[in-house]
Interface confidence: low
């Protein structure tokens, strides 16, 4: 065992090349200089090292950089990145978007691993906020990224970054997240004309308050049922039958198919049956004529 610690004569690596594939683990350890490896990291990915050989290379880099790898090495890690633990990554200071892209590319097509999540966390914290270019990059690799953030973390997203958000990026967001994102979107798109504004804001409407829905109802937007069903129940309840009719336009007929589901069900229960009848859809469950309709805020005050 002892003689294995010294590099055999003539085996000392002068550069990182394919000849190293045939080295045993102990030979790699003994014959590859860590500083040489660090300067030629870009070559490692072109060489089909075994899983175990990659462990040796990682170990050499760990010994050379116990406080964490420099960005010049990190950018060229390639598949060696998959060997890193979240603990390793927490020691890094990644500032370049190109480095982030290079590492995300390695994991492309796979679900977000704890390593990737840690890398993103380090990168975003280093930048101080989730700027547009970063958001563009992250949502390109992980469409659900935005919805994996807590409302507190989303609060660091500047309104300008909202332009990078695509509808599918918000598919898994819950109301608490949309509550944070909607005001930013409203700010980001405020200078657009009516129809263009609606196209952009539509995905964020799950965070919209009643007043904004009332305003939209005056703009002939023809909201589709899928969007309507994602609205906050508490924002929909105060809308009148006439306002919902204007908001949905020709899509109002879809209410019938959704009458047992929230928020339609709860909204129906708050409307006068006479008003519902004016829609001609056969919606049932409204308040019969002659009954007092309590204001929602008053109801909450009484309970």
């Amino acid at each position: 065992e002892v003689e294995k610690t010294a590099c055999p004569s003539g085996k000392k690596a002068r550069e990182i090349d394919e000849s190293l594939i045939f080295y045993k683990k102990w030979e790699l350890e003994a014959c590859v200089d860590a500083a040489l490896l660090a300067t030629q990291m870009d070559r490692v990915n072109a060489i089909p090292f075994t899983y175990e050989q990659l462990d040796v290379l990682k170990h050499k880099l760990d010994e050379l950089y116990p406080q964490g790898y420099p960005e010049s090495v990190i950018q060229h890690l390639g598949y060696l990145f998959l060997k890193m633990s979240p603990e390793d990554i927490r020691k890094w200071n990644v500032t370049s978007l190109e480095t982030l892209k290079a590492l995300l590319e390695v994991n492309k097509g796979h679900e977000m691993s704890p390593q990737v999540a840690t890398l993103i966390d380090r990168f975003v914290k280093g930048r101080g906020q989730l700027d547009k270019d970063t958001l563009d990059t992250l949502t390109a690799f992980y469409p659900g990224y935005l919805c994996s953030l807590s409302p507190e973390e989303l609060s660091s997203v500047p309104p300008s970054s909202i332009w990078a958000v695509r509808p599918q990026d918000l598919d898994t967001c819950d109301p608490r997240q949309l509550d944070v994102l909607y005001p930013k979107a409203r700010l980001a798109f405020q200078n657009m004309n009516g129809s263009e504004y609606f196209v952009k804001i539509q995905s964020f409407l799950g965070g919209a308050p009643t007043e904004d829905l009332k305003a939209l109802s005056q703009q002939n937007v023809s909201m589709d049922l899928a969007t309507f069903m994602k609205l906050r129940t508490d924002a929909v309840l105060p809308l009148t039958v006439a306002e919902v009719q204007k908001l949905l336009g020709p899509h109002v007929e879809g209410l019938k198919a959704e009458e047992r589901h929230r928020p339609v069900r709860d909204w129906i229960l708050r409307q006068r049956q006479d008003d519902l009848d004016t829609l001609g859809l056969g919606l049932q469950g409204g308040i019969p004529n002659g009954y007092l309709v309590l204001d929602l805020s008053m109801q909450e005050a009484l309970s």
């Epitope: 979240p86 603990e87 999540a117 840690t118 994996s148 953030l149 807590s150 409302p151 507190e152 973390e153």
Partner: nanobody
């Protein structure tokens, strides 16, 4: 040091539900991300879900829509709500976290709780 104690495992029929808990004690103020990791019989460890101190969460694709991770910082407890359980979810489930001290990061694991999904 951090001590992690899991509970809530057991035998459940396919389609059933379980809620796992992991109580943390010791240097809990240093805890950042917490993980649920599982090991099926004869298989290696695989992470199931994790939650950051800020509350952002991730679950692996195979359990998405069925498992939900949460934590109650006031009780120093991590939870995993498992619904629509399948036979392939049978495994020992471990709670895992790390804390920095002494200049390095230290990993901590619970003893594990066995979840068996079988009819």
């Amino acid at each position: 040091e951090v001590q992690l104690v899991e509970s809530g495992g057991g035998l459940v029929q396919p389609g059933g539900s379980l809620r796992l808990s992991c109580a943390a004690s010791g240097s809990t103020s240093s805890i950042n991300t917490m993980y649920w990791v599982r090991q099926a019989p004869g298989k290696g460890l695989e992470w199931v879900s994790f939650i950051s101190s800020g509350g952002s969460t991730n679950v692996r694709d195979s359990v998405k829509g069925r498992f939900t991770i949460s934590r109650d910082n006031s009780k120093n407890t991590l939870y995993l709500q498992m619904n629509s359980l399948r036979a392939e979810d049978t495994a020992v489930y471990y709670c895992n976290t790390y804390i920095p001290y002494g200049g390095t990061l230290h990993d901590f694991w619970g003893q594990g709780t066995l979840v068996t999904v079988s009819s």
